[in-house]
């Protein structure tokens, strides 16, 4: 006899990285028969939603109107059908950004390189942080973590055309409080025709996304988006 229901799916809209004072909605998708959803924050009950007939809702939304560092952290949700509770969802790391300062991102030897060349990104921030994050725009969410007193190195090694794209970095004051994003650095990797044609294209965000780095998510893209979030969040853990 089944003692628990399958775990729900949790994600943030429009994004798990939320600029300070902006709004975010945490979504929890469970089962149409659910009579209660609970959102937990850092292990404690944070909010409850109870669909009632004639609602037939398999997804509930918990709205945070004004993001701040107190709201940043790990969220999970569970739901109940009758008396039976689900397994908890995966953890959602909600990050507050635009805290304090803006780092500077540079690339060596330069933004235009040849396939096979060794490339290193440098993220610099002169305030009290020792952890840095390098993000490549795109749903596959290449995120790297680096450490240093005021600067972190991110060696990409010998690059291929798959490394092409736009990069930004953040200073991280803790796992869930990040700086403003750096200005973007676009890496252009040239290679021979064969390499280029075989290079996997990285699906990227819309061009204006990183102004507030919010991903517009239509219903059909929610799972893709959450997958993007999940990949990025693996690094946070």
């Amino acid at each position: 006899q089944q003692q628990t229901l399958p775990k729900p799916f949790i994600w943030a809209e429009p994004h798990f990285m939320v600029p300070k004072e902006k709004q975010v909605t945490i979504c929890c998708q469970g089962n149409y028969g659910a009579v209660e959803y609970q959102l937990h924050f850092e292990g404690s009950l944070f909010a409850v939603d109870r669909p009632k007939p004639p609602e037939r809702i398999n997804k509930v939304q918990f709205y945070i109107p004004d993001m701040n560092s107190r709201m940043a952290g790990q969220y999970s949700c569970i739901y109940r059908v009758g008396e039976l509770w689900s397994e908890p969802s995966n953890l959602l790391d909600l990050v507050v950004t635009e805290m304090y300062d803006t780092p500077t991102l540079s690339v060596h030897p330069g933004p235009e390189v040849i396939s096979g060349e060794k490339v290193t990104f440098y993220c610099r921030l002169d305030t009290a942080t020792s952890m840095f994050l390098l993000l490549k725009e795109g749903r596959s969410s290449h995120v790297q973590r680096g450490y240093g007193k005021v600067q972190a190195e991110f060696p990409l090694g010998p690059v291929t055309t798959a490394h092409r794209g736009t990069y930004r970095c953040f200073g991280s004051y803790n796992n869930h409080a990040w700086s403003f994003p750096s200005e973007p650095v676009k890496l252009l990797v040239t290679g021979d025709i064969e390499n280029t044609s075989l290079a996997p294209e990285d699906p990227t965000f819309p061009a204006d996304t990183w102004g507030t780095y919010l991903l517009t998510t239509e219903t059909g893209l929610q799972k893709d988006h959450a997958l993007w979030d999940h990949t990025a969040q693996n690094l946070l853990r």
Epitope: Y32, K52, P53, P54, E55, R56, I57
Partner: antibody
Framework: DVQLQESGPGLVKTSQSLSLTCSVT?????????WNWIRQFPGNKLEWVGY???????NYNPSLKNRISITRDTSKNQFFLKLNSVTTEDTATYYC??????????WGQGTSVTVSS | DIKMTQSPSSMYASLGERVTITCKAS??????LSWFQQKPGKSPKTLIY???RLVDGVPSRFSGSGSGQDYSLTISSLEFEDLGIYYC?????????FGGGTKLEIK
């Protein structure tokens, strides 16, 4: 597209039973949602009568509870309203309606029932 | 039973005007409130559920707000097709109960 159609007698005598059928096409009544009867009195006041849910469970308006029954025939994809011991106060347009938010609801066009003595 | 009191019972408004209809419950209904529109000669249709959530396919000029006992439906810019009767419905407790309706006519 879900369509609902009410049918039944337009005229019922006082103290008799009123029986209405709602035929549903384009969606199985066992799949999901709440299958309601709602009536609208002359003067436009709306009253929720009751529902049978996708799983066969019922909820009725207590003001009608001892004389109401909502049942279904899943093989015909129909659900039914039976109201016993009717009075002239049961004169109304009766709607069957599928409700299941956030989906757009679906209603029948309504059937007018007059109770006469 | 929970009594739902709607106001006004009827109103005239001009095209393009912002229109607000209110509904007051006899007790706290915890935002379990929906709004219906009934066009002349037609069946009702739900616009909003859970006080402020738009039903799929409803134009964004409709919005709902409120909590506790007091709720409102707003049409941001009235269109001709919006004329009809508007009802609120509480579904916090059985029996579900409707408001008396607001007849909206074009000035």
């Amino acid at each position: 597209d879900v369509q609902l159609q009410e049918s039944g007698p337009g005229l019922v005598k006082t103290s008799q039973s009123l029986s209405l059928t709602c035929s549903v096409t384009g969606y199985s009544i066992t799949s999901d949602d709440y299958w309601n009867w709602i009536r609208q009195f002359p003067g436009n006041k709306l009253e929720w009568v009751g529902y049978i849910s996708y799983d066969g469970s019922n909820n009725y308006n207590p003001s009608l509870k001892n004389r109401i029954s909502i049942t279904r025939d899943t093989s015909k994809n129909q659900f039914f309203l039976k109201l016993n011991s009717v009075t002239t106060e049961d004169t109304a347009t009766y709607y069957c309606a599928r409700l299941g938010y956030p989906a757009m609801d679906s209603w029948g066009q309504g059937t007018s029932v007059t109770v006469s003595s | 039973d929970i009594k739902m009191t709607q106001s006004p019972s009827s109103m005239y408004a001009s095209l393009g005007e912002r229109v607000t209809i209110t509904c007051k419950a006899s007790q706290d209904i915890n935002s379990y409130l929906s709004w219906f529109q009934q066009k002349p000669g037609k069946s009702p249709k739900t616009l909003i559920y859970r006080a402020n959530r738009l039903v799929d396919g409803v134009p964004s000029r409709f919005s709902g707000s409120g909590s506790g006992q007091d709720y409102s439906l707003t049409i941001s810019s009235l269109e001709f097709e919006d004329l009809g009767i508007y009802y609120c419905l509480q579904y916090d407790e059985f029996p579900w109960t409707f408001g008396g309706g607001t007849k909206l006519e074009i000035k």
